[in-house]
């Protein structure tokens, strides 16, 4: 390896191809799948990451598609359409012309329809509840230590502004992390809570998206915090529109 190649990598996204051919020899990285340029000083959008993931060889995928009736998105894998900024397009369709509307984190928020389905706007997910169950430990974690460690993690690893971590709840063995971010609160350059939650989810599953960094080693006062189950709930600024059939299923 040479200095140029060694230094031309994307620390925040390993699903990229980088080369030092930008203006003035700047290292430029493009997301796999979409070929879109990414800003490696911050998190890559979930849409581009999903697209990159779907472009990877099929045997690289280890997770199965969640149940049709799941109320949470357990890494619901599909090849999304992203806009020029890397956000999810409000309407997503598959190869068989089945379409549905998604929220800003790419989770379906309507029944599936055909190509005539209209999704007028991308509805923002403003509240994310990350529900974790940790493996048994000798005793419960100290709540304030746990709170501090998780807030530090979101601030330092995911670069999420502390004001967007609304609360950390703990009732052994369940930990809940609440992320809140209204459209009006999100300033230019702020990491999106949806992107931070996705990076965290992949970290917890041992599938870190960061380049060359070790996996996530969560410790509370030196005690390893090992997660055995993760559920993520998404709340949108406008409630989803599912038919009664879906709601009673």
């Amino acid at each position: 390896h040479t200095a140029a190649q060694d230094n031309c990598t994307c620390p925040t996204n390993k699903m990229t191809v980088c080369s030092p051919d930008g203006p003035g020899g700047r290292c430029q990285c493009r997301a796999l799948g979409s070929g879109m340029a990414v800003d490696c000083s911050t998190l890559t959008s979930k849409c581009l990451l999903l697209k990159a993931r779907m472009s990877a060889p099929k045997n690289a995928r280890t997770l199965v598609r969640p149940s049709e009736h799941a109320l949470v998105d357990n890494d619901g894998l599909y090849d999304p359409d992203c806009d020029p900024e890397g956000r999810f397009k409000a309407r997503q369709c598959n190869q068989t012309s089945v379409c549905w509307c998604v929220n800003s984190v790419g989770v379906r928020r309507t029944d599936k329809g055909d190509l005539s389905l209209r999704c007028d706007e991308l509805v923002r997910t403003h509240h994310i509840l990350i529900d974790l169950r940790h493996r048994p430990t000798a005793g419960a974690f100290n709540h304030s230590d746990l709170d501090a460690e998780l807030r530090r993690l979101f601030r330092e690893r995911y670069r999420l502004h502390p004001k967007f971590v609304a609360a950390v709840h703990y009732e052994q063995p369940t930990i809940q992390i609440e992320l809140r971010q209204n459209t009006s609160q999100k300033a230019a350059g702020d990491v999106d809570i949806g992107d931070a939650a996705y990076y965290f989810e992949r970290d917890i599953k041992g599938e870190s998206l960061f380049q060359g960094r070790g996996g996530l080693d969560l410790r509370v006062r030196g005690e390893p915090l090992q997660v055995e189950r993760t559920l993520i709930y998404y709340l949108d600024e406008i409630p989803p529109k599912f038919s009664m059939k879906r709601l009673t299923a």
Partner: antibody, heavy 116, light 107 residues
Framework: QVQLVQSGAEVKKPGSSVKVSCKAS????????INWVRQAPGQGLEWMGQ????????HYNQKFQGRATLTADKSTNTAYMELSSLRSEDTAVYYC?????????WGQGTLVTVSS | DIQMTQSPSSLSASVGDRVTITCKAS??????LSWYQQKPGKAPKSLIY???RLVDGVPSRFSGSGSGTDFTLTISSLQPEDFATYYC?????????FGGGTKVEIK
Amino acid sequence: QVQLVQSGAEVKKPGSSVKVSCKASGYRFTDYVINWVRQAPGQGLEWMGQIYPGSDTFHYNQKFQGRATLTADKSTNTAYMELSSLRSEDTAVYYCARFFEGLAYWGQGTLVTVSS
Amino acid sequence: DIQMTQSPSSLSASVGDRVTITCKASQGINNYLSWYQQKPGKAPKSLIYRANRLVDGVPSRFSGSGSGTDFTLTISSLQPEDFATYYCLQYDEFPLTFGGGTKVEIK
């Protein structure tokens, strides 16, 4: 150490073409971009274009689009800049420079004089 | 194209003086700015890249600062070998553009 050695001075007639070479050594040629910059007598620096030998991608200053051609010969680690339809205002010192993240190593320069 | 306005175009200073040269971009350039020194009849030499990173081997009296659109090259204590012309370059986007240059002369 990184070295860029350019071809010698040229005197050209208006309307003709000139091809300046830039031989690189001391690093892997395909790993860095080469930029071309010119400087008219007593004037400032003017960017002409950039080539990345690793993938033969290039970018040109619109001002030189169609007149300048950048190429790279990976077998000899040499970059070339050809400028056609020369006019008197093209009289300048032409520099090649290896760039990485804005940090540049420069060739010694090639004086091209266009005169009838 | 991004315009780079360098000032002053020339200045006279004495050995030991603190010298400041500024470069203003017509739009934000994300700190993708370099500074070069050029002496008569010679090729330019890199001093600073990424707005504030000193090139290996360049004396620590040279420093770069600024962000957004306004950038500064400072020579903390001018030495005899520093009399030259200085250029800034933006490499945020194509085409790359240089400032007009600042000639530092002996007072």
